[in-house]
Interface confidence: medium
Amino acid sequence: VLEVYYTSLRCRCVQESSVFIPRRFIDRIQILPRGNGCPRKEIIVWKKNKSIVCVDPQAEWIQRMMEVLRKRSSSTLPVPVFKRKIP
């Protein structure tokens, strides 16, 4: 399990993965802007199996996926049923 918590730079991601995660395994993607003590944008992925992965924002697959999701987006539909707890 990839750990996601405070570091000395106040980034949440201790390490980031570039490994492709199929969209069908993803529940939620949280975008954290850079700044406030962390020099980079962070992308945290909650998988349907409840595990949490930090994804390298430069990974081509996540950039492509974000573009596809952005183009087909609908705001505030439907209410999430999961609890986004870091284990």
Partner: antibody, heavy 127, light 107 residues
Framework: EVQLVESGGGLVLPGRSLKLSCAAS????????MAWVRQAPKKGLEWVAT????????FYRDSVKGRFTISRDNAKSTLYLQMDSLRSEDTATYYC????????????????????WGQGTLVTVSS | DIRMTQSPASLSASLGETVNIECLTS??????LAWYQQKPGKFPQFLIY???SLQDGVPSRFSGSGSGTQYSLKINSLQSEDVATYFC?????????FGSGTELEIK
Amino acid sequence: EVQLVESGGGLVLPGRSLKLSCAASGFTFSDYAMAWVRQAPKKGLEWVATVFYDGSDTFYRDSVKGRFTISRDNAKSTLYLQMDSLRSEDTATYYCAREGDYYSRHVYVGYNWFPHWGQGTLVTVSS
Amino acid sequence: DIRMTQSPASLSASLGETVNIECLTSEDINSELAWYQQKPGKFPQFLIYNANSLQDGVPSRFSGSGSGTQYSLKINSLQSEDVATYFCQQYNSYPLTFGSGTELEIK
């Protein structure tokens, strides 16, 4: 229906403290980051602070760092802003706001925009 | 901090007209921009996210466009209920920042 109701505003002397609350309903509070945004009289909007959905991380604008503390009680679905060492430039209407997300191809994407706002509570810092 | 320069500061237009509000950012924000409408004495209402995606329930006469450092909000066929102040907001980096607002009135 998402509802955010702020309370705790009022007139306070410079250097004193005040604690704002925001009661949330109509959504799973513990699933969302929350923020405070303020608006000085006849002025624009100014982001103040954000707290992560589980309370584990907080983000502040430089001018309030060390003076303001954002926190949340997920069991009570309530957001707080503890304001210490208040200054006249902190005079504003303080809005509680919920982070946004969009739903696309069975995936939720969470972002720092604000689709839901409370009605605001006015804080006046004056002697 | 990313600076948001909004123009014009105020705007007067006739009913049925098309109006444009501009928002320039001090650096590329990768279309991570939202627009809000605030009517006098009310809290802000969310209109657009990701520069051009319309929030559910917002009339289709509102549209957003732009990329890089230049963004705009367009209101087609201006209605009396559109009288408000409009703000842009970037969420590309902390601190999150807003434009100074554009006050729209009917001629």
